[in-house]
């Protein structure tokens, strides 16, 4: 059988503004023209969808308007950015890649990226 491999970094630290970016790269067993990329979060053994986008190879990645994710694609590499993160969102974020068209369908799962989010300290009152 032909296997599909998805690679993503093990750890990412979100910025002080609650933005985290990482690359999701996949080794495709076929020549897909339509690809779906989903970011999932695992918490308490439950895996839930954070955001998803379908794109045609060679075109831009498009998330829904209200999505907290943005991204760009280049060949078999997707650059993902998650915004609006807070400390409580710290966790394991999994990249899922599906080769939708043409058949056969493939699904690949990354090992997950542990994203650490630290809420910024409030600015102290100044005595001016």
């Amino acid at each position: 059988c032909k296997a599909m491999h998805v690679a993503q970094p093990a750890v990412v630290l979100a910025s002080s503004r609650g933005i985290a970016s990482f690359v999701c790269e996949y080794a495709s067993p076929g020549k897909a023209t339509e690809v779906r990329v989903t970011v999932l979060r695992q918490a308490d053994s439950q895996v839930t969808e954070v955001c998803a986008a379908t794109y045609m190879m060679g075109n831009e990645l498009t998330f829904l308007d209200d999505s907290i994710c943005t991204g760009t694609s280049s060949g078999n590499q997707v650059n993902l950015t998650i915004q609006g993160l807070r400390a409580m969102d710290t966790g394991l974020y999994i990249c899922k890649v599906e080769l939708m068209y043409p058949p056969p369908y493939y699904l690949g799962i990354g090992n997950g990226t542990q994203i650490y989010v630290i809420d910024p300290e409030p600015c102290p009152d100044s005595d001016f």
């Epitope: 059988c1 599909m4 695992q42 895996v47 493939y106």
Partner: nanobody, 115 residues
Framework: EVQLVESGGGLVQPGGSLRLSCAAS????????MGWFRQAPGKGREEVSS???????FYTDSVKGRFTISRDNAKNTLYLQMNSLRPEDTAVYYC?????????WGQGTLVTVSS
């Protein structure tokens, strides 16, 4: 070579239940992913529920609270308990497995939800 054989499909009335089984043979320790997919006529394949290599459990939104996935490692069998079935659950259900995704597929079992 890993082989997957599904069973348990059939005709059921709306609101009814079915339990699908997927028996795996030639199993490899490197199989970390097992999941259930479905394909309705004229539609693409959809991941319904899976056990991920990270140990987490995934359910697509439309089946949350109705379907339960489980795995019996001693029997090398994956199950999908489907309750409160709806007509829109009608599809061929496939079992898939692999190291990090769908390396192997079963032949599928048909689930029809109709009164």
């Amino acid at each position: 070579e890993v082989q997957l054989v599904e069973s348990g499909g059939g005709l059921v009335q709306p609101g009814g239940s079915l339990r699908l089984s997927c028996a795996a043979s030639g199993f490899s320790p490197s199989v970390n992913y097992m999941g259930w997919f479905r394909q309705a006529p004229g539609k693409g394949r959809e991941e319904v529920s899976s056990i991920y290599p990270t140990g987490g459990t995934f359910y697509t939104d439309s089946v949350k609270g109705r379907f339960t996935i489980s795995r019996d490692n001693a029997k090398n069998t994956l199950y999908l308990q489907m309750n409160s079935l709806r007509p829109e659950d009608t599809a061929v259900y496939y079992c898939a497995a692999g190291k990090y995704g769908t390396d192997y597929w079963g032949q599928g079992t048909l689930v029809t939800v109709s009164s």
